[in-house]
């Protein structure tokens, strides 16, 4: 038997993926475990193999269908179970009734690009990936810019309280290398959380013209 504290957390990307992490203090090290998803309104079910991500936590992705297919809706409830092999049988280690649209975490924004750059400002755009049509415009974004000599953690957060897939960064230093990241969150869902940060976009401001004030 496994003793200790267990935590089983899953998020739906709003289309066709449920990502789960299972943590167990004093967990079995060499045991095969999986997550099984059983929607109560659907004819399909899905399984993924839990793989170690640290000493006492495992993760896996339930791929429900084609990336942009709408496999679950606001009224679906999915029974999620962690099953671990014990000899010839499977033992239920954790179970939850999962409401997908109460537990959302979207994919990181993609296709970041510099639309226009000047000496002191830069206009950047991006796209959201695999986001449900249910949200319409009910999304918000956070962005951050990495300045030379600073860390991401020190970067101030810029909040966009609407579905706005661009930003104009102001008061930048001329001829300076920056990096930019953005993340997205639906307004819907009691346990919804921010997406991962996008891949950083590197850009450089234009040098100040000679003889001009900066």
């Amino acid at each position: 038997a496994v003793n200790g504290t267990s935590q089983f957390t899953c998020f739906y990307n709003s289309r066709a993926n449920i990502s789960c992490v299972w943590s167990q203090d004093g967990a079995l090290q060499d045991t095969s475990c999986q997550v099984h998803a059983w929607p109560d309104r659907r004819r399909w079910n899905q399984t993924c193999e839990l793989l170690p991500v640290s000493q006492a936590s495992w993760a896996c992705n339930l791929i429900l269908g084609a990336p942009d297919s709408q496999k679950l809706t606001t009224v679906d409830i999915v029974t999620l179970r962690v099953l671990c092999r014990e000899g010839v049988r499977w033992r239920v280690m954790a179970i939850q009734d999962f409401k997908p649209f109460e537990n959302l975490r979207l994919m990181a924004p993609i296709s970041l690009q510099v639309v226009h750059v000047e000496t002191h400002r830069c206009n950047i755009s991006w796209e959201i990936s695999q986001a449900s049509h249910y949200f319409e415009r009910h999304l918000e974004f956070e962005a951050r810019t990495l300045s030379p000599g600073h860390t991401w953690e020190e970067a101030p957060l810029l909040t966009l309280k609407q579905k706005q897939e661009w930003i104009c960064l102001e008061t930048l230093t001329p001829d300076t290398q920056y990096e930019f990241q953005v993340r997205v969150k639906p307004l819907q869902g009691e346990f919804t959380t921010w997406s991962p940060w996008s891949q950083p976009l590197a850009f450089r401001t234009k040098p100040a013209a000679l003889g001009k004030d900066t």
Epitope: D40, R42, S69, Q70, T74, V75, I77, T79, D97, H133
Partner: antibody
Framework: EVQLVQSGGGLVQPGGSLRLSCAAS????????MSWVRQAPGKGLEWVSA????????HYADSVKGRFTISRDNSKNTLYLQMNSLRAEDTAVYYC?????WGQGTLVTVSS | DIQLTQSPSSLSASVGDRVTITCRAS??????LNWYQQKPGKAPKALIY???NLETGVPSRFSGSGSGTDFTLTIISLQPEDFATYFC?????????FGQGTKVEFK
């Protein structure tokens, strides 16, 4: 073999009440959401209500909201529909259903 | 609510004919569309689930296709026992909604 066996239909006066039952067998009842669907004489099908597998979530058609209550007893593998304040327009054959399996239907007649 | 528009409302056919019935949804329902056969005084019988999957025990002359908003039920060679009413159901989201039905009659 999957079976959904219905009972509880009959003749009732307007304003009256009736409770329909649907006994399930041949599948893991608690793993499936269940619905009630009705069909008025000579008409098409109309969804009435649904309940999640655990019973914790319910949904109703606007036409029955506040009058009908869906419930389930997973220990008895049984689905229920409590119908109150019945009207003439509720007259229909009522089916308990999942998309794959339907009960045999039970006739509810609301008439004075 | 999602509307399902089924056509034709009726058709006349002979044994051995190929029959095609269509169902169009007012918005995308992914692949969550089911087809049923109903005979007078009987409960509906499931034929196809999730747009294209044949229910257990249903003859292979029945097939379904489509996704998003446009769906088709095809009977490749109509048999005497196939004369009935057919309808589609979306179970993508509540409320479930149904097509108006297609009555397949003897020519």
């Amino acid at each position: 073999e999957v079976q959904l066996v219905q009972s509880g239909g009959g003749l009732v006066q307007p304003g009256g009440s009736l409770r329909l039952s649907c006994a399930a067998s041949g599948f893991t009842f608690s793993s499936y959401a269940m619905s009630w669907v009705r069909q008025a004489p000579g008409k098409g099908l109309e969804w009435v209500s649904a309940i999640s597998g655990s019973g914790g979530s319910t949904h109703y058609a606007d036409s029955v909201k506040g009058r009908f209550t869906i419930s389930r007893d997973n220990s008895k593998n049984t689905l229920y529909l409590q119908m109150n304040s019945l009207r003439a327009e509720d007259t229909a054959v009522y089916y308990c259903a999942t998309p794959a399996f339907w009960g045999q239907g039970t006739l509810v007649t609301v008439s004075s | 609510d999602i509307q399902l528009t089924q056509s034709p409302s009726s058709l006349s056919a002979s044994v051995g004919d190929r029959v095609t019935i269509t169902c169009r949804a007012s918005q995308s329902i992914s692949s969550y569309l089911n087809w049923y056969q109903q005979k007078p005084g009987k409960a509906p019988k499931a034929l196809i689930y999730d747009a294209s999957n044949l229910e257990t025990g249903v003859p292979s002359r029945f097939s379904g296709s489509g996704s998003g908003t446009d769906f088709t039920l095809t009977i490749i060679s109509l048999q005497p026992e196939d004369f009935a009413t057919y309808f589609c159901l979306q179970d993508y989201i509540y409320p479930w909604t149904f097509g108006q039905g297609t009555k397949v009659e003897f020519k």
